[in-house]
């Protein structure tokens, strides 16, 4: 790793306030210079003396200075230095640190548990519908339909491993070919990236934090969408994934391996299984056209059952209908035959909350969906708060330098690939890309990890989840081994192909640029984040699904003009930015279009009107609800009483001037103090050394 630059004195004058604005840093440190530093060089620290944060004079930056909102905030240390503390203070500080660590791990645990329960909730609400998507016969002939089914099912069950395992079981029972399964797997890859996007929405309270978090989450979405955009047509034309994986599967004589290690589940399962337990086989059975499964509940009631294979006597219209000629008889009145049946005897009920309620799946799902989102949101707020108080000063600098600094020249290019490996390794440990990327999201939001670094970590996470699938495939029974392994390898090579497309050359790292663009839009119009989520994960897939059901002609008839318009707009946009002189004067900008077609401002007004009612009721809602409120109504005033998204950014609505909200300041303690949350004296006892 690159050596850490020597830190200058963090705060020479304790009476002066230092600026390193969160999200609006005047000057960005030069990366190339920074990476070449040696141990003895001193990092220059730009220090700007500020007025106290409650002075409104500091809230608006000079428009002349161009700020980069993507630069990481400097979380300044306001506490007493370790060396200046007495023994009692040091002990107190040590225990405070231990307490914070325990709290952090606790909230992290419940955060991961809530993600698991959120997945269960989605499966209860939409699992059966998801299963029915799979039973559509057009999947075989229409790769686009397969893709959107993959997206929709994974979004509905909140788990790519669930949708992948359904695909595997369908392939192994010859209901689906590997060729037809590949687009579904690609869709599952897209669908799984919704989880961390939902998590990013929880950080809506702070504009700059939200900008980073949302961009950091959607970088995963854009990578997946762009990969599919390029690789699906390539796969349809060449079947390269199918051919490569088939060669690999046929060249190795695999024996059934051990089960994929459940590392994180071992810790979370004891808690999550007390909340709800699901019978995941039901979704697979629906996908495989099992009529009886449609009436079964997904909520597991019996955990201990005894399965006994026995023969029962059943009546048949005539002896010609006998299952076996030798096992056929009449009692003089009815004709009988013996039928092999598996008799399941229920022994012990499951130990979870919903076992004796006998509520419909939708009701259980809705309850769990609301509760898990509340816990998820609450844990996220607390994680961000704890991390915010811990990651200050030297600790923050060390962590940020470690994570975000590149290797020294000429090995700087290797850093990203190491990050990919780290992402893959971490995902393998937690056994879920959703959990890993969701845990990454708040760290991007608070500015510990840059989007540039989060991108390879996310790509690694995509790889990590496929290695888990490969291990699971190797552990599957004989009849499913070949198909499950081939599908897992398809998933793996699809992600490898995507990385080769969108990572090695910095110019091709389009997902970062697109995610930052979306982050900027969503920071200004926060409702757009929800809009994006609905459009990309529900409306577009559902539209394609509907059009595909109507037939190829309809799909092409609607799709071709839409694609043509998109390409036209992109080409025009490219020409406008690169060589506008080639274009006629009228086409050199978008002013020839009506305002609603080229700006979100009119739409913002419409959304504001619709959410006006929320603004009225917003004031007395709790912190968590308030965040949801603010997300919808994008209101700076409405949540003043609960402080959760108090936001003095009215000026930004009127003019495009970067505005500082108290929470976006470098010093969290000061901004809290300014808002009247923490007594002024408390800022002195802030303990940051661990």
């Amino acid at each position: 790793m690159a050596p850490w630059p020597e830190l200058g004195d963090a705060q020479p004058n304790p009476d002066k306030y230092l600026e390193g604005a969160a999200g609006q840093q005047p000057t960005a440190p030069d990366k190339s210079k920074e990476t070449n530093k040696t141990d003895n060089t001193e990092a220059p620290v730009t220090k700007i003396e500020l007025l106290p944060s409650y002075s409104t004079a500091t809230l608006i930056d000079e428009p002349t200075e161009v700020d980069d909102p993507w630069n990481l905030p400097t979380l300044q240390d306001s506490g007493i230095k370790w060396s200046e503390r007495d023994t009692k203070g040091k002990i107190l500080c040590f225990f405070q640190g231990i307490g914070r660590l325990i709290l952090l791990l606790g909230f992290l645990y419940f955060f991961v548990c809530s993600l698991d329960i959120l997945s269960s909730a989605f499966q209860l609400v939409g699992g059966k519908m998801a299963g029915q998507f799979f039973s559509n016969s057009s999947i075989m002939s229409n790769p686009l339909l397969g893709l959107v089914i993959g997206v929709l099912v994974t979004v509905l069950v909140q788990s790519s491993s669930t949708s992948t395992s359904i695909v595997v079981s369908m392939v192994s029972s010859s209901l689906l070919t590997v060729r037809a399964a590949i687009p579904i797997i690609m869709g599952a890859n897209i669908g799984t990236s919704i989880t961390n996007t939902i998590v990013a929405l929880m950080q809506v309270g702070d504009r700059s934090e939200f900008r980073r978090a949302f961009a950091g989450a959607t970088v995963h979405d854009f990578f997946n969408w762009l990969s599919v955009l390029v690789l699906l047509p390539v796969e349809v034309a060449t079947h390269y994934l199918e051919i490569i994986t088939q060669l690999i599967v046929e060249s190795f004589h695999f024996k059934n391996g051990e089960d994929a290690p459940d590392l994180l589940k071992v810790i979370t399962k004891p808690f999550t299984k007390l909340i709800v337990q699901l019978d995941k086989k039901v979704i697979s059975q629906i996908a495989m056209n099992d009529e009886k499964a449609k009436n079964k509940s997904l909520v597991k009631i019996w955990c201990k059952t005894f399965t006994n294979k026995t023969q029962i006597n059943v009546t048949v219209p005539s002896t010609a209908n006998c299952t076996s000629p030798s096992l056929c008889w009449t009692d003089g009145i009815q004709n009988w035959t013996m039928k092999n049946v598996t008799y399941k005897e229920n022994i012990a009920k499951c130990q979870h909350i919903f076992v004796n309620f006998h509520l419909p799946d939708l009701a259980v799902g809705t309850i769990l969906l609301i509760l898990s989102l509340l816990v998820l949101c609450g844990c996220l707020i607390m994680i961000v708060k704890i991390l915010g108080s811990v990651l200050k000063g030297q600790v923050a600098t060390v962590i940020k330098k470690t994570i975000n600094t590149d290797f020294p020249f000429p090995f700087a290019w290797l850093t990203g690939y190491l990050a990919i490996l780290v992402g893959a390794g971490m995902t393998f440990i937690v056994q879920s890309s959703s959990v890993f990327t969701s845990a990454l999201t708040p760290l991007i939001g608070i500015g510990v990890i840059t989007i540039e670094r989060a991108y390879p970590l996310t790509l690694g996470s995509n790889i990590g989840t496929t290695t888990t699938a490969i291990l699971a495939a190797l552990a599957s029974p004989g009849n499913a081994l070949r198909s499950s392994l081939q599908i897992a390898l398809c998933h793996f090579f699809f992600n490898i192909s995507g990385i080769l497309l969108w990572y090695p050359i910095p110019f091709t790292r389009l997902p970062i640029r697109m995610a930052k663009g979306l982050g900027n839009i969503s920071a200004k119009y926060r409702w757009f984040a929800v809009f994006y989520l609905i459009i990309f994960f529900f409306l577009i897939p559902l539209t394609v699904f509907g059009l595909s059901l109507a037939g190829w002609r309809v799909l092409v008839g609607v799709g071709v003009p839409v694609v043509f318009i998109i390409i036209l707009v992109l080409c025009l946009r490219l020409l406008q930015s690169r060589c506008p002189r080639v274009l006629p004067k009228k086409l050199q900008n978008w002013n020839f279009l009506p305002l609603w077609m080229r700006s979100l401002k009119p739409w913002d007004a419409v959304v504001s009107k619709f959410t006006g009612c929320f603004q009225m009721r917003c004031c007395c809602c709790c912190r968590v609800c308030c965040r949801a409120c603010c997300l919808l109504c994008d209101c700076p005033k409405c949540c003043r009483c609960s402080k959760c998204c108090e936001d003095l950014e009215e000026a930004q609505e009127g003019q495009d001037v970067p505005v500082k909200a108290p929470e976006t300041f470098d010093n969290i303690t000061i901004s809290r103090e300014a808002q009247g949350e923490v007594p002024a004296s408390d800022s002195k006892t802030e303990c940051t050394a661990l």
């Epitope: 006597n313 000629p325 030798s326 056929c328 008889w329 009449t330 009692d331 003089g332 009145i333 004709n335």
Partner: antibody, heavy 120, light 107 residues
Amino acid sequence: QVQLVQSGAEVKKPGSSVKVSCKTSGFFFTEYIIHWVRQAPGQGLEWIGGIIPNNDVTNYKQNFRGRVTLTADKSTSTAYMELSSLRSEDTAVYYCARWRNAYYSAMDSWGQGTTVTVSS
Amino acid sequence: DIQMTQSPSSLSASVGDRVTITCTASQDVGTAVAWYQQKPGKVPKLLIYWASTRHTGVPSRFSGSGSGTDFTLTISSLQPEDVATYYCQQYRTSPLTFGGGTKVEIK
């Protein structure tokens, strides 16, 4: 113990009817089928028909259809066989036998038999 | 209707002899065959069902075998109390039909 007790011997004129009863005990009447089998003097066994007392479903051998009626009274666990339009060749010992419903164990218990004599 | 033909119609054997009675069905009846014993002046009694399964309380010297169309009832060691007429019955299809019977006597 399992018992199937049949009514006493009957002497009937040709063209008349006879009703033989079979009172059962020692088992669940509704779980069994009651069959009727006859044996002409010095001859072999011939199946007449059977009834499921639980739902009163019956089946008869083709050459007895229209002449024989099988009934069952669940309250008294008794089965009845009525044979009409009697002919001299109907002279035989009539047996009732039980057969466990939905099972292939055949006729495992028989009544003592009722002798029906048809003579003018 | 399925015809059940028993042979011989009567046989005479000494005590302790192995006695075999055969029964031939006019068509395949699988293993849906039962054997009954009717002692003189008594009611028939079930010996074997499902071609080879001994009914409760039936001595082990009685055994049944066969499937399809050919069936046999074997008395491994004939006893004086075994003097009776033996009937085979098919219950593969309705109507239930019996064989003509085989009369077993002691020499």
